[in-house]
Each structure stands twice: as structure tokens, then as C-alpha cells.
Amino acid sequence: NADGLKEPLSFHVTWIASFYNHSWKQNLVSGWLSDLQTHTWDSNSSTIVFLCPWSRGNFSNEEWKELETLFRIRTIRSFEGIRRYAHELQFEYPFEIQVTGGCELHSGKVSGSFLQLAYQGSDFVSFQNNSWLPYPVAGNMAKHFCKVLNQNQHENDITHNLLSDTCPRFILGLLDAGKAHLQRQVKPEAWLSHGPSPGPGHLQLVCHVSGFYPKPVWVMWMRGEQEQQGTQRGDILPSADGTWYLRATLEVAAGEAADLSCRVKHSSLEGQDIVLYWEHHSSVG
């Protein structure tokens, strides 16, 4: 993918609301282009915070103002509604509601939209076409919640348009505005170190790869040209500068480490893989 983001691409907004008791609550809202955070919500000023220079996409100031207003009112209304119906729905304090909604793009075309609500980390209800539906496993509480949410068809119509129209228009504009940033290629740095000893006579070899962009990367411990199937890849973790970090580990008998190497493949390297040999690695670190 030329945009440096794995297909399918998505834009989604996540709302995490914590209800500690009847009067004390807190919420966190963020906007994400796939796994890159692009927006956050400032609860104090009720404004959208743009985290990247291109986070506005191609939406006008007027459109942002309108979305801000809509978001502010819906947040207030959601808090009011959940607090009002908490007892009826058997929501027990403290509890957490998580909502995620957005749309997906596949090969430049809209492939779908989604809006899901979870209660205490479990699927509860989702928005399909023009109304809220309960997850079967969520039981009668979820059915009742849908009844409440579906009272206002006008709000559901607006939600449908936000998901099926506004979101796809926005994601296309966002990709265009952020093209230079998203298409950039940043070369990884790699280094080797010892991990904690797995046991007597054994070593844990660690290959660190950091500072690369985009995210897809291939890292493997090798013996000559042979991939070592015992290679354990960690999660690819974000760095503060928007690049990524990964570590790959391998456990071996102390005498078998000499001819091992770590190989790194990444699009920024243009076929020139990084190869680091354990025998050349200094014992410091």
C-alpha cells in the first residue's frame, strides 16, 4: 500500500466513558487513522484537538465546528441517558462504556462502516443500517438498551449518514492531506543484546529494530540462509516520533550462538537487508 498503512484502512473514533458513581464520570475520546492517532477531544473546552498538521483533512472550518457541536451535545446526551437508565439497565457502578465507530476503505473504495458499544469490555449493542441491535450474548439488558436508543429515529438517521457518508468522505480527504507523511519511508536501526538468561548454559539473543516507518517489517534470526523457527517476535510498538519498534528474540544453547545473525527487511531499505551477526556483537548491554 502506497500510503504506508496496511489495507483495509480505517478511520474510527473511540469513546471510553467511565462511570464511577451517579455523579462522577470521565471520558476519553480519540480519533484514529488505522493505528495512528490523529485527533483527541478536549473535554474542558469541548473542542477537537488536531494531532497532525493534516488532521483536518479537506473538511472546512465550518464542518469542523458543526461536528464539534454535534459531538459536544451527543456526549452530554449520552452521559445523561446512561445515568438515567443505569438502574433500569442494571449497570452497576463503577462501570465502563466503550464505543467505537468509523468506516473502512479497501483499494480506495468504501468497504463498510461500524459502530459498536461495549459494556464492561464485552460486546453489548451495535448499529446496523439505521438502528441499534443487541448482541445475542448480551441478553435482555442489551435488548432494553436498544429500545431506548431506537426511540429517536432522527438521531439514528444522522448516525447512519455520519457513518456511511461523512466518514468515507473524511477518510479520503485525510489520506490525501496526509499523503506526504503517510508515504514517507524511514529506515530502521537495529542492534543486538542479551536478554535475561533462560537457564544454565542457554542464552536469550535479542534483536532490536527501531525507528522504522511504515509499520510492516520482517525480522528473523538466521543461521546462514536458514530461518530460525524459534524466533519470537514481540508486538510492534509505537514510538513517540510516529515510528515503530520491534524486538525479536531467540533462545539457544550457549555454544550455538556463534554463527547466528538477525536479518531485517523493510520497504525503506529497498532490498538492502540489514544483517547483524551475533559473533560481532559486543558483550556489553
Epitope: S60, E62, E63, E66, L67, T69, L70, R72, I73, I76, R77, E80, N152, Q153, H154, E155, D157, I158, N161, L162, D165, T166, R169
Partner: antibody, heavy 117, light 107 residues
């Protein structure tokens, strides 16, 4: 700043069909709800219906059986048809733009439609 | 449909007066309440949206408050150009409905 302008016949006979068009100049046509609102002489405002720019519609139940709103995005305009008019349909008809929150932030200047035999 | 009731239906005031118009909804509408000003022969003009947000270009002497069922439009210091009819409108559910209007006249 978006500007709206209504056009259409100002004088109708009972049972005829009222037909008005609203041209939208400047600003974006996408992402908005385009409404028709009317005001009988000396009276209050009544919402007739809206069309979302992508084509979905919503009508006032009190007029639903007689109303059709359509859109032509290539011309940045939308239209109102109200069938079987009576003297009670005599009013100034306004077209208006609304964002998701359904407040009407831009209005046409209004056109008086009189129904008289 | 949600009924919107404005009071008073008319009032007389002088330039410089503080004027308050109230609007009551027949059911809770959260903050989905908007205010308009209309002068004779002209289209309505949006003053306040979402109960308390001032529309761009509207003087700061206009303010809105309230949530649920009871809302207020306040003009802090009435100016000659403010003599007009004011309407509230709910946008909580369709059909959007308007109050019957409050006419502000010169005393």
C-alpha cells in the same frame, strides 16, 4: 458563505401542484440537509421536509402524502413538489441549509406562493 | 410531534433594556434548541444553536441557556435593530418544530 435562491410559480389554482427549486451558490453541497420551510401570512414557521445531499429524505408527517423533495447535485439545487394544493397552502416558502444538528443556518429570501381560484 | 411553547407572545421594551424570552418543550430535548430572529418581509436568521452556542457574526448581547425542557434567550441590552419576532426551534427529533414566536416591540 452559502447563498440560497428559490424560484417557481407564485400563483396556483386549487388542486394544482406547487413546484419550487432552490439553487445553492458557494460553499459545499455535501454533508448537509437541505430543507423546505413555509410560513403562512402573519403566522409561524412550519418545516416541510429535508433531503440529504446524497438523496435520503424526511418529510413532515402532516404533509408527507403530498410532498416530494428531490436533489440535483450536479447543479447544486434541490426541489419541492406539493400536490393537490388548497388555500391553506398559501405561504412564503423558504429553502434552508442545515448541518447534522438540524439548525437552519442559511436561508433563501423566500417566495410567496398564493393558491386561489 | 414535540410542541414548543414560547412566552410571552409579545413584549414591549426600550432600547438598553434586558429582554428575556422563554421556550418550553413538551418533552426533554437535551440541548437541541435553536433561536432565530425574523424581521418583517425577511427570512429568519439563526442567532443561537445547540441551546447556548452563538452563531458566527451574531452580536454577543444575545445569549441562550437551558437544557431538557426549559430554555431562555436573553438580549442583554436591547438595540434599535433588535425589534423583531423571535422563534425557538427544537432539532431533537423530526419533524423539527418551531415555537409560535415572540414579537419584541418598541415601548
Amino acid at each position: 458563505q452559502v447563498q440560497l435562491q428559490e424560484s417557481g410559480a407564485g400563483l396556483l389554482k386549487p388542486s394544482e401542484t406547487l413546484s419550487l427549486t432552490c439553487a445553492v451558490y458557494g460553499g459545499s453541497f455535501s454533508g448537509y440537509y437541505w430543507s423546505w420551510i413555509r410560513q403562512p401570512p402573519g403566522k409561524g414557521l412550519e418545516w416541510i421536509g429535508y433531503i440529504y445531499y446524497s438523496g435520503s429524505t424526511n418529510y413532515n408527517p402532516s404533509l408527507k402524502s403530498r410532498v416530494t423533495i428531490s436533489v440535483d447535485t450536479s447543479k447544486n439545487q434541490f426541489s419541492l413538489k406539493l400536490s393537490s394544493v388548497t388555500a391553506a397552502d398559501t405561504a412564503v416558502y423558504y429553502c434552508a441549509k442545515a448541518p447534522y444538528m438540524m439548525y437552519f443556518d442559511s436561508w433563501g429570501q423566500g417566495t410567496l406562493v398564493t393558491v386561489s381560484s | 410531534d414535540i410542541q414548543m411553547t414560547q412566552s410571552p407572545s409579545s413584549l414591549s421594551a426600550s432600547v438598553g433594556d434586558r429582554v428575556t424570552i422563554t421556550c418550553r418543550a413538551s418533552q426533554s430535548i437535551s440541548s437541541y434548541l435553536n433561536w432565530y430572529q425574523q424581521k418583517p418581509g425577511k427570512a429568519p436568521k439563526l442567532l443561537i444553536y445547540a441551546a447556548s452556542s452563538l452563531q458566527s457574526g451574531v452580536p454577543s448581547r444575545f445569549s441562550g441557556s437551558g437544557s431538557g425542557t426549559d430554555f431562555t434567550l436573553t438580549i442583554s441590552s436591547l438595540q434599535p435593530e433588535d425589534f423583531a419576532t423571535y422563534y425557538c426551534q427544537q432539532s431533537y427529533s423530526t419533524p423539527p418544530t418551531f415555537g409560535q414566536g415572540t414579537k419584541v416591540e418598541i415601548k
